[in-house]
């Protein structure tokens, strides 16, 4: 069975084809090759002789037991080598020779028992080494690590490391890898020698499900003393053994670390006193809780010095009381409990993401809701009912505003966005908005992107609501049940590049409304009911137009519409997916491609 | 289409068939078997995925006695610092995991429940597997 040609001459997918040897009928130009799940078993010298251009090679689950010297020799362009799930028993010292550009080596679940004997010391370009799910017992980083000066990610998770000693990290003292991210999750740790991490600098350290008791966790965290880490991730996994007890003593040792960003990811435990618990983390710049349950929501009004707070997938009794002077970014997404938004006091806030919480807002939006006048980014998407009762008073700095898939009320009663002259991006898609007021977008003089798919218009008619949006470059009006539009609806949009009118109820096509769109490049009219043209004579679309989508419409392939069908043929170079432009009527021509039709109509004399 | 039996409990019988053409082997055990009136137990899965499990989600299509419920999307793995350790599993890596579950107080009417589970993962998104579970429910009391 042949391999699947994904990208001709470049990418080949040969997964699970029962190959016992490397295929010899693929082009020399192959760059990406997936040979996973084939019983190759043995890689001899110059196994990839015929693949001089190879950049990505996937050998997952190939039952490889032996890799000989020079197996990858001559793959000087290879950047990614994946060996996941091979029961390697014999790995020659020169197994990885010739890989002078290798950046990513994945040797997950390969029976690797030690880093010491892993022959990768010459791979100077290596950025990512993943040796998770192996049998490694010692965390001693071998001397050859001093050659791996580009290493950024080392994944040692799911191994058998129990202890970390001062001597294990000696090589990092000799050559501080300022950018190294280290994942030690799911190792059964019970001892970290104090001083082992002293004066070590890491970009990220992840320790999840490492400790089987609170005491072990406490002493191991104390053993991290002296570590300087940009991002520390602690926590557990839902499907692994969890701590039975967790209290403030667990994290006391963090006072002896220098931490820029902290994240606690999943804890099967109710956090009741976060002030005491995170006492050592009051001055980290970014603080993040993922999948934890928080009892006392008032604690977030304590004087923490955080600049970024992230609460994701957490459970709350009610919406938390947030009063944080220094906070610039708040991400509060996919949380449960506390369905009603209550005012927060965050005077420095510039970025606020409150998406996917099922929240309802009795009144939106003004500076009093968020306690800030500095807000530039506001995401309230995928929430409940949001009643628009204020026109963003004090929030004039806003540049990005997203309401998609929330239920907006009172949107057509006044110019809601009147004061948002700095707004660049607005998404009100699928918000149950019914446009009945022409001034709905007044004030948005800087707006570049407007997404309003899935809403509706009075009498299914698009009026002149865009007159002030002179900088608009992207407009999505899809799924709005539109049947007609004002001939001057788009007259002021001279910068518009993309217009999506798909999935509406237009029965005819007219070029007149687009005559002023001098920058228009993409026009999508797919999934309408277009049968013919509005006027007998269709003009040309703007000369800037490059893509016109008329697929999945109801073309009437009859003589009375001959001029329209001819006009469509004349637009051939603009049309996309022409094979999906089919006749709907008459019945004998149903399903026939419009462009292949040859309609010869006799003129009645 | 071969049917794979999972388990029987006092009020339910659970089995599944594959609804994709690949039919990559997957081993599913429930201990103790689910009782629909209330249940607490462990779900054990042994599986070797054909793609990374990063950003795994399930599309669930549930039918109750021939009545189709709306499609549900259940996100399991968001993509970073996920709740489940198997979210970091790579293509070809053994997934051997036990997940605890519990529910109570749901009243199910007697009949045949079908649940098509489409597992989607990776970037670009592709189907990982598709299983159709059939639960025959005979409540002792309702």
């Amino acid at each position: 069975e042949p391999c699947v040609e994904v990208v001709p001459n470049i990418t080949y997918q040969c997964m699970e084809l029962n190959f016992y040897k490397i295929p010899d009928n693929l082009p020399f130009s192959t760059k990406n090759l997936d040979l996973s799940f084939n019983p190759l078993r043995h890689l001899g010298s110059y196994s990839f002789f015929s693949f001089p251009e190879l950049q990505v090679l996937d050998l997952s689950r190939c039952e490889i037991q032996t890799i000989e010297d020079g197996a990858y020799q001559s793959l000087s362009h290879l950047s990614t080598l994946i060996l996941t799930g091979n029961p390697i028993q014999s790995l020659a010292l020169g197994a990885f020779s010739g890989l002078s550009s290798l950046q990513k080596l994945v040797a997950v679940e390969t029976n690797l028992a030690s880093l010491e004997n892993f022959p990768i010391g010459h791979l100077k370009t290596l950025k990512e080494l993943n040796v998770a799910h192996n049998l490694i017992q010692s965390f001693k980083l071998p001397e050859y690590f001093s050659n791996l000066t580009n290493l950024e990610h080392l994944d040692l998770s799911s191994n058998k490391i129990q202890s970390i000693y001062c001597t294990d990290l000696r090589v990092l003292h000799q050559m501080p890898l300022l950018n190294l991210s280290l994942d030690l999750s799911l190792n059964p740790m019970n001892f970290i020698q104090p001083g082992a991490f002293k004066e070590i600098r890491l970009h990220k350290l992840t320790l999840r499900n490492n400790f089987d008791s609170l005491n072990v966790m406490k002493t191991c965290i104390q053993g991290l003393a002296g570590l300087e880490v940009h991002r520390l991730v602690l926590g557990e996994f839902r499907n692994e053994g969890n701590l039975e007890k967790f209290d403030k003593s667990a994290l006391e040792g963090l006072c002896n670390l220098t931490i820029e960003e902290f994240r606690l990811a999943y804890l099967d435990y109710y956090l009741d006193d976060i002030i005491d618990l995170f006492n050592c983390l009051t001055n980290v710049s970014s603080f993040s809780l993922v999948s934890v349950t928080i009892e006392r929501v008032k604690d977030f009004s304590y004087n923490f010095g955080w600049q970024h707070l992230e609460l994701v997938n957490c459970k709350f009794g009610q919406f938390p009381t947030l009063k944080l002077k220094s906070l610039k970014r708040l991400t509060f997404t996919s949380n449960k409990g506390g369905n009603a938004f209550s005012e927060v006091d965050l005077p420095s806030l510039e970025f606020l993401d409150l998406s996917r919480n099922g929240l309802s807002f009795k009144g939106c939006c003004s500076q009093s809701d968020f306690g800030t006048t500095s807000l530039k980014y506001l995401d309230l998407s995928f929430n409940g009912v949001i009643t628009m009762s204020s026109n963003f008073l004090g929030l004039e700095q806003l540049e990005h505003l997203d309401f998609q898939h929330s239920n907006l009320k009172q949107m057509s009663e006044f110019s809601v966005f009147l004061s948002l002259r700095n707004l660049i991006y607005l998404d009100i898609s699928h918000t149950h908005t019914r446009v009945a007021f022409n001034g709905i977008f007044n004030g948005l003089s800087s707006l570049e992107v407007l997404k309003m798919a899935g809403n509706s218009f009075q009498e299914n008619f698009l009026p002149d609501i865009f007159t002030e949006l002179r900088n608009l470059t992207f407009l999505d009006l899809s799924q709005c049940q539109l049947e007609q539009l004002s001939p001057t609806a788009f007259n002021s949009l001279s910068s518009l590049q993309v217009l999506n009118m798909s999935h509406n109820n237009f029965f005819s096509l007219d070029t007149f409304p687009y005559k002023c769109l001098n920058s228009l490049q993409v026009l999508d009219y797919s999934l309408n009911h277009i049968m013919t043209s509005k006027k007998q004579e269709l003009q040309h679309f703007p000369s800037s137009l490059a893509f016109l989508n008329l697929t999945q419409n109801d073309f009437a392939c009859t003589c009375e519409h001959q001029s329209f069908l001819q006009w469509i043929k004349d637009q051939r170079q603009l049309l996309v997916e022409v094979e999906r432009m089919e006749c709907a009527t008459p019945s004998d021509k149903q399903g026939m491609p419009v462009l292949s039709l040859n309609i010869t109509c006799q003129m009645n004399k | 289409q071969k049917q794979y039996w999972v388990c029987n409990s006092s009020d339910a019988s659970i089995s599944y068939t594959y609804c994709d053409k690949m039919q990559y082997p997957i081993s599913i055990n429930v201990n103790p078997c689910i009782e629909l009136k209330r249940s607490k137990g462990l779900l054990h899965i042994f599986y070797i995925p054909r793609r990374d499990l990063k950003q795994l989600y399930f599309n669930l299509y549930i039918t109750v006695n021939t009545m189709n419920l709306p499609k549900r999307k259940e996100v399991i793995c968001r993509g970073s610092d996920d709740d489940y350790s198997f979210c970091r599993a790579l293509k070809g890596e053994t997934v051997n995991t036990t997940i605890s579950f519990s529910f109570k107080g749901i009243k199910f009417s007697k009949g045949k429940y079908k649940c098509v589970v489409e597992a989607i993962s990776g970037s670009p998104e592709e189907m990982l597997f598709c299983l159709e579970f059939v639960i025959l429910h005979q409540p002792n009391s309702n």
């Epitope: 040897k21 010899d24 009928n25 020399f28 001899g44 110059y46 196994s47 002789f49 015929s50 | -």
Partner: nanobody
């Protein structure tokens, strides 16, 4: 078993030309691809050019594109490498190699090419 014998190496001035030959003998029917590799002192062996017997498709390393030409003479079971516009950085031992249907790779003993004024 396949035997390969190279010839044609030598000393040449920058800008000059050389033609290397590689004669194959033994189980030549099993050969899929043949090619030329080179190894400069202290460097890894690298691809120069490849040719596929079945369809005649050809590959050249970027460093030799437009200057070197690989060809074959089926009747004589010989592969040639015509090297024009030679540069000092082309100095290396040039090896002929053949890959069989069983994925085994056979090598010649190598021929020295020196480009120097």
């Amino acid at each position: 078993e396949v035997q390969l014998v190279e010839s044609g190496g030598g000393l040449v001035q920058p800008g000059g030309s050389l033609r290397l030959s590689c004669a194959a003998s033994g189980s030549i029917f099993s050969i899929n691809d043949m090619g030329w590799f080179r190894q400069a002192p202290g460097k890894e062996r690298e691809h120069v050019a490849l040719i596929r017997f079945k369809d005649g498709s050809i590959y050249y390393a970027d460093s030799v594109k437009g200057r070197f030409t690989i060809s074959r003479d089926n009747a004589k079971s010989t592969v040639y490498l015509q090297m024009n516009s030679l540069k000092p950085e082309d100095t290396a031992v040039y090896y002929c190699a053949a890959k069989t249907g069983t994925s085994f790779v056979y090598w010649g003993q190598g021929t020295q090419v020196t480009v120097s004024s």
